[in-house]
Amino acid sequence: LVPHLGDREKRDSVCPQGKYIHPQNNSICCTKCHKGTYLYNDCPGPGQDTDCRECESGSFTASENHLRHCLSCSKCRKEMGQVEISSCTVDRDTVCGCRKNQYRHYWSENLFQCFNCSLCLNGTVHLSCQEKQNTVCTCHAGFFLRENECVSCSNCKKSLECTKLCLPQIENVKGTEDSGTT
């Protein structure tokens, strides 16, 4: 099956790479604008220059294009704990990230939040914290993993999933309760 091409892709595919078809005259192929610039005016005729202008401050284009406007620079989301790794330039968008000893959690494809890496208190580090993944902890005996923290089995209730890991402790607690004075 031939993939369905959008109108713009169809128009571009008629011209050689690095060129696009003139929107008013499909017999003319114009040279695309370099990254960091945008299309101000189409080329007037074959072999003539496309009028490209540099992106203004706060905007960019990261690849060759025939966009009528540059793209707005992204802003790092302070409310999500993000910090600026590198600022926006005419040919590259802002790069946002997290502070040291933090990782990114993606709530969706284009939204991430920064969280502190787990320290694995009352446990050991199974896998170190990475850019997009929290530390993986293995808990010591008498502790179970809850929300990536090692929690004492004394906090394990029978209804929770921790009962298998904490079974001896649960029995001890139960035994203590049963041995009350009558």
């Epitope: 989301r77 302070k78 409310e79 969280f115 929300e147």
Partner: nanobody, 119 residues
Framework: EVQLLESGGGLIQPGGSLRLTCAAS????????MVWVRQAPGKGLEWVSH????????YYADSVKGRFTISRDNSKNTLYLQMNSLRAEDTAVYYC????????????RGQGTLVTVSS
């Protein structure tokens, strides 16, 4: 005790509008970034929108951009979601939540309000 109570859901025809409200109590509302998430039948939680403490910075999922508007009234401890041009795919239970701090789970989330978009 933190409480988040959503209201305003219901059955609405495609193209219609609804305004969801979330009444918050038990914490300092004005100090928290607030979130709307939704869960469609048989699907996972989807981040819809969030708004920072002062209502200055907002975020919208691509699927709702231009149709939904998040706002807040700190004097009333209330969060809103104005939903316009509703589509069948917006059918879900909508929850308001406090932006998590410790990790990627919601410590504080409401019981939800069901929005059904159908003709």
């Amino acid at each position: 005790e933190v409480q988040l109570l959503e209201s305003g859901g219901g059955l609405i025809q495609p193209g219609g509008s609804l305004r969801l409200t979330c009444a918050a109590s038990g914490f300092t509302f004005a100090h928290e970034t607030m979130v709307w998430v939704r869960q469609a039948p048989g699907k996972g939680l989807e981040w819809v929108s969030h708004i920072d403490r002062v209502g200055q910075d907002t975020y919208y999922a691509d699927s709702v951009k231009g149709r939904f508007t998040i706002s807040r009234d700190n004097s009333k401890n209330t969060l809103y979601l104005q939903m316009n041009s509703l589509r069948a795919e917006d059918t879900a239970v909508y929850y308001c939540a406090v932006l998590p701090k410790r990790g990627p789970w919601f410590d504080y989330r409401g019981q939800g309000t069901l929005v059904t978009v159908s003709s």
